[in-house]
């Protein structure tokens, strides 16, 4: 796995421990918590990052209205089970044998049950809506400049292919970034929109996952773009299954 060979560190994930005893005597970086060797040339999966985090010494509107099937991550942090590739296992359980099904970004998509709960497949989150509110500025940002800057950010910092940034909407002070990536569109080596969204979320909270890089310094035509609130909606290829009790 690629890592900075000279001093054996992982540029894309600071929640790793690296040592020069990988294949061929190369630098190998392991995610804290799981011990899985990660590829430091790209983003680490959200599942491995969450596991590491849990183990760490610890009108004519242009804005999109999320539909009734959109999920928000209200459950907060948990210690997830990841598969050998670092993806979330479809069924997650806690220490008290309470289980639930999750989507590909690890967000619960069913009611909680017991160990008999079945989650037949990992349902893909194909549409992510990142809803941001920026701090007051002298004037509104130019929409096309803002669009270009956010697309550049996702392309350069998170290595997300530009085709997966579907749209950037702006209605001061709210910015919405739409990421779309169907199963059929995602080729081997493509960064997953869920991983990119998670890195972005941590960046805007001032909790960058990148090694040694400064925090996120977003500027639009030299004007700082400071985010004061973030809300992320997740839409799955198959709608979630919650009981009516939860919806009322």
């Amino acid at each position: 796995h690629t890592a900075a060979q000279d001093n054996c560190t992982c540029p894309t994930n600071k929640m790793t421990v690296c040592s020069p005893d990988g294949p061929g005597g190369r630098c190998q970086c392991r995610a804290l918590g799981s011990g899985v060797a990660v590829d430091c040339s790209t983003l680490t999966s959200k599942c491995l990052l969450l596991k590491a985090r849990m183990s760490a010494p610890k009108n004519a509107r242009t804005l999109v209205r999320p539909n009734e099937h959109a999920l928000v991550d209200n459950d907060g942090l948990y210690d997830p089970d990841c598969d050998p590739e670092g993806r979330f296992k479809a069924r997650q359980c806690n220490q008290t044998s309470v289980c639930w099904c999750v989507n590909s970004v690890g967000v619960r998509r069913t009611d909680k049950g017991d160990l008999s709960l079945r989650c037949d497949e990992l349902v893909r989150t194909h549409h992510i809506l990142i809803d941001l509110r920026h701090r007051p500025t002298a004037g509104a940002f130019n929409h096309s400049d803002l669009d270009a800057e956010l697309r550049r950010l996702f392309r350069e910092r998170y290595r997300l292919h530009p085709k997966f940034v579907a749209a950037v909407h702006y209605e001061q002070p709210t910015i919405q970034i739409e990421l779309r990536q169907n199963t059929s569109q995602k080729a081997a080596g493509d960064v997953d929109i869920g991983d990119a969204a998670y890195y972005f979320e941590r960046d805007v909270k001032g909790e960058s996952l990148f090694q040694g890089r400064g925090g996120l310094d977003l500027r639009v035509r030299g004007e700082p773009l400071q985010v004061e609130r973030t809300l992320i909606y997740y839409l799955d290829e198959i709608p979630p299954k919650f009981s009516m009790k939860r919806l009322t």
């Epitope: 040592s19 005893d21 294949p23």
Partner: antibody
Framework: QVQLQQSGAELVRPGASVKLSCKAS????????INWVKQRPGQGLEWIGN????????NYNQKFKDRATLTVDKSSSTAFMQLSSPTSEDSAIYFC????????WGQGTTLTVSS | DIVLTQSPATLSVTPGDSVSLSCRAS??????LHWYQQKSHESPRLLIK???QSISGIPSRFSGSGSGTDFTLSINSVETEDFGMYFC?????????FGSGTKLEIK
């Protein structure tokens, strides 16, 4: 050359804590994981856990998590494993090893737990 | 935890024979598998790392292959000094685990 030198055989009473040591030489101690492995007479090998000396990150096999404690002393390039409340089941040879593919092994420390 | 299953448990061979030892993982571990030899009253010795990479000082008659879940240690023309226990070990994720071993004995 790389060497891992382990402390001598130990005879302890059941319930009495014991601390084994592993002194590393011939390489940069802080750059490689140190693992501890248990082997009962005529049995297989069992991974207890590991520690990364640079940041003292530790991982444990769930089976040993409550009773084994791994530490290091970077100044002397020495790793330690403390075993609390040992029973006869803990009578075994304990090896320290280096890395992920365990390329260097200590000579082993024989622990006997007996009253 | 990842379970490693070694087969056969015992292999009786004549010096000069060529043998294959198997190690199967309960889930994919890429190439993160290592092979060790252990003789009575000695520490184990690394023979092959990362499924197929040779180790300095280990005779060339030892070779490894496999990826994912199925791995093989081959000994081309066994010599008397090769008799003993052979263990596989995975370093794909914590906790690291070992196979239960294959005993190579003289027929």
């Amino acid at each position: 050359q790389v060497q891992l030198q382990q402390s001598g055989a130990e005879l302890v009473r059941p319930g009495a804590s014991v601390k084994l040591s592993c002194k590393a030489s011939g390489y940069t101690f802080t750059s490689y994981w140190i693992n501890w492995v248990k082997q009962r007479p005529g049995q297989g090998l069992e991974w207890i856990g590991n520690i990364f000396p640079s940041g003292s990150y530790t991982n444990y096999n769930q089976k040993f998590k409550d009773r084994a404690t791994l530490t290091v002393d970077k100044s002397s390039s020495t790793a330690f494993m403390q075993l609390s409340s040992p029973t006869s089941e803990d009578s075994a040879i304990y090896f320290c090893t280096r890395g992920s593919g365990f390329d260097y092994w200590g000579q082993g420390t024989t622990l006997t737990v007996s009253s | 935890d990842i379970v490693l299953t070694q087969s056969p448990a015992t292999l009786s061979v004549t010096p000069g024979d060529s043998v294959s030892l198997s190690c199967r993982a309960s889930q994919s571990i890429s190439n993160n598998l290592h092979w060790y030899q252990q003789k009575s009253h000695e520490s184990p010795r690394l023979l092959i790392k990362y499924a197929s990479q040779s180790i300095s000082g280990i005779p060339s008659r030892f070779s490894g292959s496999g990826s994912g879940t199925d791995f093989t240690l081959s000994i081309n023309s066994v010599e008397t000094e090769d008799f003993g226990m052979y263990f596989c070990q995975q370093s794909n994720s914590w906790p690291f685990t070992f196979g239960s071993g294959t005993k190579l004995e003289i027929k």
